[in-house]
Protein backbone atom coordinates (compact mmCIF):
# COMPACT_ATOMS: atom_id res chain seq x y z
CA UNK A 1 0.00 0.00 0.00
CA UNK A 2 1.16 3.83 -0.58
CA UNK A 3 4.06 4.84 1.40
CA UNK A 4 3.32 7.65 3.94
CA UNK A 5 6.83 8.47 4.49
CA UNK A 6 6.67 9.46 0.60
CA UNK A 7 4.07 12.39 1.51
CA UNK A 8 6.34 13.46 4.57
CA UNK A 9 4.42 11.79 6.84
CA UNK A 10 5.32 9.36 9.81
CA UNK A 11 2.90 5.80 10.89
CA UNK A 12 2.10 6.41 14.55
CA UNK A 13 2.89 2.60 14.89
CA UNK A 14 5.94 0.88 11.89
CA UNK A 15 4.80 -2.49 10.64
CA UNK A 16 6.58 -4.72 8.07
CA UNK A 17 5.12 -5.86 5.39
CA UNK A 18 5.78 -9.53 3.32
CA UNK A 19 4.86 -12.07 1.10
CA UNK A 20 4.44 -15.19 2.71
CA UNK A 21 4.14 -18.63 1.18
CA UNK A 22 1.81 -21.22 2.32
CA UNK A 23 5.07 -23.47 2.57
CA UNK A 24 6.28 -21.47 5.35
CA UNK A 25 2.56 -20.46 6.74
CA UNK A 26 2.01 -24.07 6.97
CA UNK A 27 -1.17 -23.89 9.66
CA UNK A 28 -3.60 -21.38 10.26
CA UNK A 29 -6.89 -20.52 12.54
CA UNK A 30 -10.06 -20.61 10.66
CA UNK A 31 -12.86 -19.07 11.70
CA UNK A 32 -14.31 -21.13 13.87
CA UNK A 33 -11.27 -21.53 15.87
CA UNK A 34 -9.44 -24.74 14.47
CA UNK A 35 -6.03 -25.09 13.38
CA UNK A 36 -5.98 -25.89 9.87
CA UNK A 37 -3.45 -27.12 7.23
CA UNK A 38 -2.87 -24.44 4.36
CA UNK A 39 -2.03 -26.36 1.56
CA UNK A 40 1.00 -24.87 -0.83
CA UNK A 41 -1.01 -25.12 -4.05
CA UNK A 42 -4.36 -24.56 -5.66
CA UNK A 43 -5.29 -26.50 -8.45
CA UNK A 44 -6.57 -23.79 -11.38
CA UNK A 45 -7.77 -24.90 -14.70
CA UNK A 46 -4.30 -25.20 -16.74
CA UNK A 47 -2.06 -25.96 -13.43
CA UNK A 48 -1.62 -25.03 -10.38
CA UNK A 49 -0.60 -21.85 -8.71
CA UNK A 50 1.67 -21.58 -5.18
CA UNK A 51 -0.61 -20.13 -2.27
CA UNK A 52 0.70 -16.44 -1.16
CA UNK A 53 -0.20 -14.12 1.94
CA UNK A 54 0.05 -10.49 1.94
CA UNK A 55 1.28 -10.03 5.44
CA UNK A 56 1.53 -6.97 7.46
CA UNK A 57 2.49 -6.90 11.36
CA UNK A 58 3.88 -4.50 14.10
CA UNK A 59 7.70 -4.27 13.59
CA UNK A 60 10.05 -5.24 15.92
CA UNK A 61 12.90 -3.99 15.47
CA UNK A 62 11.12 -0.23 14.63
CA UNK A 63 11.25 2.80 16.91
CA UNK A 64 7.27 2.00 18.02
CA UNK A 65 8.11 -1.07 19.63
CA UNK A 66 8.24 0.78 23.17
CA UNK A 67 4.74 2.79 22.60
CA UNK A 68 3.20 4.34 19.41
CA UNK A 69 4.63 7.67 17.85
CA UNK A 70 3.26 10.93 18.52
CA UNK A 71 0.97 10.40 21.77
CA UNK A 72 0.08 12.60 24.28
CA UNK A 73 2.10 10.96 27.31
CA UNK A 74 0.38 12.83 30.07
CA UNK A 75 -3.21 11.23 29.61
CA UNK A 76 -2.48 7.84 27.64
CA UNK A 77 -0.26 4.59 27.77
CA UNK A 78 -0.18 3.53 24.36
CA UNK A 79 0.89 0.09 22.37
CA UNK A 80 1.63 -0.95 18.62
CA UNK A 81 -0.37 -4.04 18.22
CA UNK A 82 -0.73 -6.62 15.33
CA UNK A 83 -4.24 -6.81 13.51
CA UNK A 84 -5.27 -9.76 11.57
CA UNK A 85 -8.31 -10.16 9.00
CA UNK A 86 -9.64 -12.83 6.94
CA UNK A 87 -8.94 -14.29 4.10
CA UNK A 88 -10.31 -17.34 1.97
CA UNK A 89 -7.60 -20.30 1.33
CA UNK A 90 -7.11 -23.53 0.42
CA UNK A 91 -7.11 -25.84 3.51
CA UNK A 92 -7.47 -29.01 5.27
CA UNK A 93 -9.13 -29.46 8.48
CA UNK A 94 -8.12 -32.28 11.07
CA UNK A 95 -10.99 -34.72 9.14
CA UNK A 96 -8.32 -34.77 5.97
CA UNK A 97 -11.39 -32.77 4.63
CA UNK A 98 -9.72 -29.89 1.47
CA UNK A 99 -11.76 -26.88 1.20
CA UNK A 100 -11.63 -23.06 0.86
CA UNK A 101 -12.03 -21.75 4.15
CA UNK A 102 -11.17 -18.35 5.69
CA UNK A 103 -8.01 -18.02 7.72
CA UNK A 104 -6.95 -15.20 9.67
CA UNK A 105 -3.81 -13.58 8.88
CA UNK A 106 -1.58 -10.07 10.00
CA UNK A 107 -2.83 -7.74 8.19
CA UNK A 108 -1.78 -4.33 10.24
CA UNK A 109 -0.05 -2.34 12.93
CA UNK A 110 -2.62 -0.27 15.20
CA UNK A 111 -2.40 1.77 17.95
CA UNK A 112 -3.86 1.45 21.01
CA UNK A 113 -4.52 3.63 23.93
CA UNK A 114 -5.51 3.24 27.64
CA UNK A 115 -5.61 6.20 29.77
CA UNK A 116 -3.08 6.38 32.63
CA UNK A 117 -4.85 6.63 36.38
CA UNK A 118 -3.90 8.78 39.40
CA UNK A 119 -2.30 11.48 37.58
CA UNK B 1 -10.23 -9.29 14.64
CA UNK B 2 -10.48 -9.23 18.56
CA UNK B 3 -11.80 -6.03 20.03
CA UNK B 4 -9.43 -4.10 22.03
CA UNK B 5 -12.41 -1.88 23.79
CA UNK B 6 -12.96 -5.28 25.77
CA UNK B 7 -9.33 -5.01 27.07
CA UNK B 8 -10.66 -1.45 28.28
CA UNK B 9 -8.97 -0.42 25.12
CA UNK B 10 -8.97 3.09 22.68
CA UNK B 11 -8.06 2.80 19.40
CA UNK B 12 -5.93 5.81 17.74
CA UNK B 13 -8.52 5.26 14.91
CA UNK B 14 -12.09 3.92 14.66
CA UNK B 15 -12.86 1.93 12.18
CA UNK B 16 -15.66 -0.84 10.62
CA UNK B 17 -15.57 -4.05 9.45
CA UNK B 18 -17.66 -5.67 7.01
CA UNK B 19 -18.21 -8.32 4.31
CA UNK B 20 -18.21 -7.40 1.22
CA UNK B 21 -19.27 -9.98 -1.91
CA UNK B 22 -17.79 -9.90 -4.77
CA UNK B 23 -21.30 -9.32 -6.96
CA UNK B 24 -21.19 -6.16 -4.74
CA UNK B 25 -17.59 -4.76 -5.46
CA UNK B 26 -18.00 -5.67 -9.03
CA UNK B 27 -14.40 -4.04 -9.83
CA UNK B 28 -11.75 -3.76 -8.12
CA UNK B 29 -7.43 -2.58 -8.96
CA UNK B 30 -4.98 -5.19 -9.47
CA UNK B 31 -1.47 -5.22 -8.53
CA UNK B 32 -0.18 -3.84 -12.16
CA UNK B 33 -2.57 -0.82 -11.30
CA UNK B 34 -5.13 -1.91 -13.83
CA UNK B 35 -9.30 -2.36 -13.01
CA UNK B 36 -9.91 -6.06 -13.23
CA UNK B 37 -13.97 -7.24 -12.71
CA UNK B 38 -14.03 -9.19 -9.89
CA UNK B 39 -15.74 -12.76 -10.56
CA UNK B 40 -19.24 -13.46 -8.43
CA UNK B 41 -18.52 -17.23 -8.26
CA UNK B 42 -15.26 -19.48 -7.92
CA UNK B 43 -15.29 -22.76 -9.21
CA UNK B 44 -14.24 -25.43 -6.59
CA UNK B 45 -13.97 -29.32 -6.43
CA UNK B 46 -17.65 -30.31 -7.18
CA UNK B 47 -19.56 -27.10 -6.46
CA UNK B 48 -18.98 -23.28 -6.48
CA UNK B 49 -18.41 -20.62 -3.82
CA UNK B 50 -19.12 -17.03 -3.54
CA UNK B 51 -16.08 -14.70 -3.20
CA UNK B 52 -16.57 -12.68 -0.37
CA UNK B 53 -13.85 -10.38 1.18
CA UNK B 54 -13.63 -9.05 4.54
CA UNK B 55 -13.14 -5.34 4.46
CA UNK B 56 -12.02 -2.68 7.06
CA UNK B 57 -11.85 1.11 6.68
CA UNK B 58 -11.88 4.01 9.05
CA UNK B 59 -15.25 4.85 10.49
CA UNK B 60 -16.83 8.18 9.02
CA UNK B 61 -19.19 8.31 10.99
CA UNK B 62 -16.73 7.89 14.31
CA UNK B 63 -15.28 10.54 16.58
CA UNK B 64 -11.77 10.29 14.79
CA UNK B 65 -12.92 11.86 11.42
CA UNK B 66 -11.25 15.05 12.39
CA UNK B 67 -7.99 13.34 13.77
CA UNK B 68 -6.66 11.03 15.65
CA UNK B 69 -7.48 10.15 19.11
CA UNK B 70 -4.78 10.49 21.87
CA UNK B 71 -2.36 12.33 19.70
CA UNK B 72 -0.18 15.30 21.61
CA UNK B 73 -1.43 18.15 19.08
CA UNK B 74 0.90 20.63 20.15
CA UNK B 75 3.65 18.95 18.30
CA UNK B 76 1.95 17.04 15.63
CA UNK B 77 -0.94 17.39 13.39
CA UNK B 78 -3.00 13.35 12.92
CA UNK B 79 -4.94 11.79 10.19
CA UNK B 80 -6.62 8.72 10.34
CA UNK B 81 -6.03 6.87 6.98
CA UNK B 82 -7.24 3.51 5.27
CA UNK B 83 -4.87 1.53 4.07
CA UNK B 84 -5.10 -1.57 1.86
CA UNK B 85 -3.70 -5.10 1.31
CA UNK B 86 -3.88 -7.45 -1.61
CA UNK B 87 -5.82 -10.54 -1.79
CA UNK B 88 -6.08 -13.11 -4.48
CA UNK B 89 -9.03 -13.64 -6.29
CA UNK B 90 -10.66 -14.71 -9.62
CA UNK B 91 -11.05 -11.57 -11.72
CA UNK B 92 -11.71 -11.11 -15.44
CA UNK B 93 -9.18 -8.22 -16.77
CA UNK B 94 -9.89 -6.19 -20.01
CA UNK B 95 -9.37 -8.51 -22.59
CA UNK B 96 -11.70 -10.96 -20.90
CA UNK B 97 -9.16 -12.99 -19.60
CA UNK B 98 -10.45 -15.12 -16.39
CA UNK B 99 -7.39 -15.46 -13.55
CA UNK B 100 -6.33 -15.35 -10.23
CA UNK B 101 -5.05 -11.75 -9.27
CA UNK B 102 -4.05 -10.15 -6.17
CA UNK B 103 -6.58 -7.27 -5.51
CA UNK B 104 -6.27 -4.32 -3.33
CA UNK B 105 -8.35 -4.21 -0.29
CA UNK B 106 -9.27 -2.19 2.69
CA UNK B 107 -8.21 -3.70 5.07
CA UNK B 108 -7.24 -1.43 8.51
CA UNK B 109 -7.48 2.23 9.57
CA UNK B 110 -3.91 3.54 11.06
CA UNK B 111 -2.82 7.17 12.05
CA UNK B 112 -0.52 9.12 9.96
CA UNK B 113 1.31 11.80 11.54
CA UNK B 114 2.74 15.45 10.58
CA UNK B 115 5.46 17.27 12.20
CA UNK B 116 3.74 20.95 13.60
CA UNK B 117 5.94 23.37 11.79
CA UNK B 118 6.78 27.14 12.97
CA UNK B 119 5.50 26.74 16.42
CA UNK C 1 -28.93 -11.99 19.19
CA UNK C 2 -29.95 -12.28 15.71
CA UNK C 3 -33.78 -11.31 15.06
CA UNK C 4 -35.53 -11.84 11.54
CA UNK C 5 -39.43 -10.90 11.32
CA UNK C 6 -41.52 -11.16 8.01
CA UNK C 7 -44.61 -9.32 7.78
CA UNK C 8 -46.65 -8.90 5.05
CA UNK C 9 -48.68 -12.03 4.55
CA UNK C 10 -52.50 -12.45 4.20
CA UNK C 11 -55.28 -13.85 1.55
CA UNK C 12 -55.19 -12.64 -1.65
CA UNK C 13 -57.07 -13.60 -5.08
CA UNK C 14 -55.29 -15.39 -8.32
CA UNK C 15 -53.08 -12.68 -10.00
CA UNK C 16 -53.20 -10.11 -7.52
CA UNK C 17 -50.09 -8.94 -5.89
CA UNK C 18 -48.39 -8.41 -2.08
CA UNK C 19 -45.31 -7.06 -0.81
CA UNK C 20 -43.71 -9.12 2.08
CA UNK C 21 -41.11 -7.50 4.30
CA UNK C 22 -38.23 -8.59 6.85
CA UNK C 23 -36.84 -6.65 9.75
CA UNK C 24 -33.63 -7.81 10.94
CA UNK C 25 -31.36 -6.99 13.68
CA UNK C 26 -28.67 -8.47 15.64
CA UNK C 27 -25.96 -8.53 12.80
CA UNK C 28 -24.52 -6.25 9.95
CA UNK C 29 -26.98 -6.48 7.64
CA UNK C 30 -25.69 -5.28 4.52
CA UNK C 31 -22.76 -7.75 5.07
CA UNK C 32 -25.30 -10.53 3.95
CA UNK C 33 -26.90 -12.86 1.25
CA UNK C 34 -30.52 -12.75 2.45
CA UNK C 35 -33.14 -15.39 0.78
CA UNK C 36 -36.84 -16.34 0.93
CA UNK C 37 -37.73 -19.79 1.21
CA UNK C 38 -41.33 -20.98 1.07
CA UNK C 39 -42.98 -23.98 2.28
CA UNK C 40 -46.58 -24.80 0.75
CA UNK C 41 -48.84 -26.50 3.60
CA UNK C 42 -47.84 -30.17 4.77
CA UNK C 43 -45.11 -30.25 2.42
CA UNK C 44 -41.43 -29.64 2.23
CA UNK C 45 -39.04 -26.14 2.01
CA UNK C 46 -38.30 -24.67 -1.58
CA UNK C 47 -35.86 -21.75 -2.25
CA UNK C 48 -37.32 -19.02 -3.96
CA UNK C 49 -34.97 -15.75 -4.06
CA UNK C 50 -31.72 -14.69 -2.95
CA UNK C 51 -29.82 -11.41 -2.76
CA UNK C 52 -26.32 -9.53 -2.28
CA UNK C 53 -25.93 -7.79 0.66
CA UNK C 54 -25.74 -4.55 -1.25
CA UNK C 55 -28.51 -5.81 -3.91
CA UNK C 56 -25.84 -6.43 -6.82
CA UNK C 57 -27.12 -9.67 -7.38
CA UNK C 58 -30.53 -11.47 -7.45
CA UNK C 59 -31.11 -15.19 -8.14
CA UNK C 60 -34.82 -16.60 -8.49
CA UNK C 61 -36.38 -19.79 -8.62
CA UNK C 62 -37.55 -20.93 -12.00
CA UNK C 63 -41.39 -21.02 -10.55
CA UNK C 64 -41.04 -17.51 -9.75
CA UNK C 65 -38.81 -15.65 -12.21
CA UNK C 66 -40.58 -12.80 -13.78
CA UNK C 67 -43.17 -12.44 -11.68
CA UNK C 68 -41.64 -12.19 -7.88
CA UNK C 69 -38.61 -9.55 -7.07
CA UNK C 70 -36.48 -9.13 -4.53
CA UNK C 71 -34.93 -5.95 -3.14
CA UNK C 72 -33.78 -4.81 0.39
CA UNK C 73 -33.15 -1.45 1.92
CA UNK C 74 -29.96 -1.04 3.91
CA UNK C 75 -31.06 1.72 5.78
CA UNK C 76 -33.95 0.23 7.41
CA UNK C 77 -32.29 -3.20 7.98
CA UNK C 78 -35.24 -4.40 5.87
CA UNK C 79 -35.53 -7.42 3.06
CA UNK C 80 -38.78 -7.60 0.53
CA UNK C 81 -40.23 -9.74 -1.57
CA UNK C 82 -42.77 -8.03 -4.27
CA UNK C 83 -44.99 -10.80 -5.36
CA UNK C 84 -46.83 -9.76 -8.50
CA UNK C 85 -49.39 -12.67 -10.69
CA UNK C 86 -50.11 -14.95 -7.63
CA UNK C 87 -50.98 -18.21 -7.77
CA UNK C 88 -52.77 -20.64 -5.78
CA UNK C 89 -49.70 -23.23 -5.81
CA UNK C 90 -47.81 -19.73 -4.12
CA UNK C 91 -49.82 -20.31 -1.38
CA UNK C 92 -47.16 -21.12 1.45
CA UNK C 93 -45.54 -20.01 4.68
CA UNK C 94 -42.51 -17.57 3.57
CA UNK C 95 -39.45 -17.65 5.73
CA UNK C 96 -36.84 -15.22 5.26
CA UNK C 97 -33.39 -16.67 6.08
CA UNK C 98 -29.74 -15.41 6.24
CA UNK C 99 -26.91 -16.96 4.12
CA UNK C 100 -23.43 -17.80 5.55
CA UNK C 101 -20.33 -17.22 3.93
CA UNK C 102 -20.97 -20.70 2.57
CA UNK C 103 -24.37 -20.60 0.95
CA UNK C 104 -26.75 -22.25 4.17
CA UNK C 105 -28.73 -20.84 6.13
CA UNK C 106 -27.78 -19.94 9.96
CA UNK C 107 -30.78 -17.87 11.08
CA UNK C 108 -34.54 -17.94 10.06
CA UNK C 109 -37.58 -16.17 10.76
CA UNK C 110 -40.94 -17.34 11.69
CA UNK C 111 -42.58 -16.68 8.70
CA UNK C 112 -44.95 -15.41 7.35
CA UNK C 113 -48.29 -17.07 5.47
CA UNK C 114 -49.40 -16.35 2.00
CA UNK C 115 -52.73 -17.59 0.89
CA UNK C 116 -53.83 -17.20 -2.73
CA UNK C 117 -57.53 -18.60 -3.32
CA UNK C 118 -60.18 -17.53 -4.78
CA UNK D 1 -30.76 -29.06 -10.62
CA UNK D 2 -29.36 -31.16 -7.98
CA UNK D 3 -32.13 -32.72 -6.34
CA UNK D 4 -31.58 -34.36 -3.04
CA UNK D 5 -33.66 -37.35 -2.65
CA UNK D 6 -34.03 -38.31 2.04
CA UNK D 7 -35.24 -41.64 3.22
CA UNK D 8 -37.57 -43.21 5.00
CA UNK D 9 -40.31 -40.47 4.80
CA UNK D 10 -41.04 -41.42 8.21
CA UNK D 11 -39.07 -43.01 10.95
CA UNK D 12 -40.89 -44.29 13.95
CA UNK D 13 -38.44 -44.77 17.05
CA UNK D 14 -38.50 -44.77 21.00
CA UNK D 15 -37.14 -42.16 23.12
CA UNK D 16 -33.55 -43.26 23.55
CA UNK D 17 -32.62 -45.20 20.28
CA UNK D 18 -30.79 -44.42 17.20
CA UNK D 19 -31.61 -42.33 14.71
CA UNK D 20 -30.11 -42.84 11.36
CA UNK D 21 -31.39 -40.62 8.22
CA UNK D 22 -30.36 -40.46 4.93
CA UNK D 23 -29.83 -37.98 1.70
CA UNK D 24 -28.50 -38.96 -1.41
CA UNK D 25 -27.49 -36.12 -4.30
CA UNK D 26 -28.24 -36.91 -7.57
CA UNK D 27 -24.83 -35.91 -8.67
CA UNK D 28 -21.25 -35.26 -6.19
CA UNK D 29 -21.76 -32.23 -4.41
CA UNK D 30 -17.98 -32.71 -2.53
CA UNK D 31 -19.63 -32.20 1.30
CA UNK D 32 -21.84 -29.25 0.84
CA UNK D 33 -24.23 -30.28 2.19
CA UNK D 34 -26.68 -28.89 5.49
CA UNK D 35 -29.41 -30.10 7.96
CA UNK D 36 -32.27 -28.48 9.20
CA UNK D 37 -34.54 -29.60 12.20
CA UNK D 38 -38.07 -28.44 11.97
CA UNK D 39 -40.57 -29.01 14.58
CA UNK D 40 -44.60 -28.03 13.79
CA UNK D 41 -45.23 -24.14 14.03
CA UNK D 42 -41.49 -23.35 14.36
CA UNK D 43 -39.06 -22.37 11.78
CA UNK D 44 -36.10 -24.48 10.44
CA UNK D 45 -33.03 -24.67 12.37
CA UNK D 46 -29.50 -25.23 10.89
CA UNK D 47 -28.08 -28.30 12.69
CA UNK D 48 -24.95 -29.64 10.31
CA UNK D 49 -23.33 -27.58 7.71
CA UNK D 50 -20.44 -29.31 5.90
CA UNK D 51 -22.01 -32.72 5.90
CA UNK D 52 -20.68 -33.24 9.20
CA UNK D 53 -19.36 -30.00 11.21
CA UNK D 54 -22.22 -29.08 13.72
CA UNK D 55 -23.67 -25.55 14.24
CA UNK D 56 -23.26 -23.62 17.26
CA UNK D 57 -25.18 -24.62 20.07
CA UNK D 58 -26.28 -28.29 18.76
CA UNK D 59 -25.96 -31.33 21.13
CA UNK D 60 -23.59 -33.30 20.50
CA UNK D 61 -25.70 -36.67 20.00
CA UNK D 62 -26.30 -34.86 16.36
CA UNK D 63 -24.00 -35.97 13.97
CA UNK D 64 -23.45 -35.88 10.22
CA UNK D 65 -21.25 -37.42 7.78
CA UNK D 66 -20.73 -38.85 4.08
CA UNK D 67 -19.67 -37.00 0.89
CA UNK D 68 -19.87 -37.30 -2.93
CA UNK D 69 -23.52 -38.64 -3.13
CA UNK D 70 -24.49 -40.38 0.01
CA UNK D 71 -24.79 -38.30 3.47
CA UNK D 72 -26.21 -39.62 6.83
CA UNK D 73 -27.84 -37.85 9.89
CA UNK D 74 -27.21 -39.77 12.99
CA UNK D 75 -29.01 -38.95 16.58
CA UNK D 76 -27.02 -40.93 18.73
CA UNK D 77 -30.22 -41.08 21.51
CA UNK D 78 -33.07 -39.71 20.97
CA UNK D 79 -34.87 -36.83 23.11
CA UNK D 80 -38.29 -36.11 23.54
CA UNK D 81 -37.42 -32.56 22.01
CA UNK D 82 -35.80 -34.17 18.95
CA UNK D 83 -38.92 -35.65 17.67
CA UNK D 84 -39.39 -33.65 14.50
CA UNK D 85 -38.58 -33.23 10.67
CA UNK D 86 -35.36 -33.14 9.02
CA UNK D 87 -34.32 -31.62 6.12
CA UNK D 88 -30.96 -31.70 4.08
CA UNK D 89 -30.09 -28.94 1.42
CA UNK D 90 -27.03 -28.99 -0.81
CA UNK D 91 -25.15 -25.55 -1.72
CA UNK D 92 -22.76 -27.68 -4.05
CA UNK D 93 -24.47 -26.11 -7.14
CA UNK D 94 -26.83 -23.03 -7.01
CA UNK D 95 -29.04 -21.34 -8.15
CA UNK D 96 -31.17 -23.24 -7.26
CA UNK D 97 -30.38 -24.26 -3.94
CA UNK D 98 -32.56 -27.59 -3.09
CA UNK D 99 -33.88 -28.99 -0.20
CA UNK D 100 -34.51 -33.02 0.23
CA UNK D 101 -38.08 -33.82 0.68
CA UNK D 102 -37.59 -34.45 4.33
CA UNK D 103 -38.00 -37.13 7.01
CA UNK D 104 -40.50 -36.98 9.66
CA UNK D 105 -38.88 -39.06 13.35
CA UNK D 106 -41.82 -39.66 15.18
CA UNK D 107 -42.64 -41.15 18.52
CA UNK D 108 -43.01 -45.00 18.17
Known amino acids: HSDPARRGELSVCDSISEWVTAADKKTAVDMSGGTVTVLEKVPVSKGQLKQYFYETKCNPMGYTKEGCRGIDKRHWNSQCRTTQSYVRALTMDSKKRIGWRFIRIDTSCVCTLTIKRGR | HSDPARRGELSVCDSISEWVTAADKKTAVDMSGGTVTVLEKVPVSKGQLKQYFYETKCNPMGYTKEGCRGIDKRHWNSQCRTTQSYVRALTMDSKKRIGWRFIRIDTSCVCTLTIKRGR | DVQLVESGGGVVRPGESLRLSCAAS????????MNWVRQAPGKGLEWVSGISGRGGSTYYADSVKGRFTISRDNSKNTLYLQMNSLRAEDTAIYYC???????????WGLGTLVTVSS | EIVLTQSPGTLSLSPGERATLSCRASQPINYYLAWYQQKPGQAPRLLIY???SRATGIPARFSGSGSGTEFTLTISSLQSEDFAVYYC??????????FGGGTKVEIK
Open chain 4, 89 to 98: QQYSDWPPLT
Open chain 3, 26 to 33: GFTFSSYY
Open chain 3, 97 to 107: AKETLNVFFDY
Open chain 4, 50 to 52: DAS
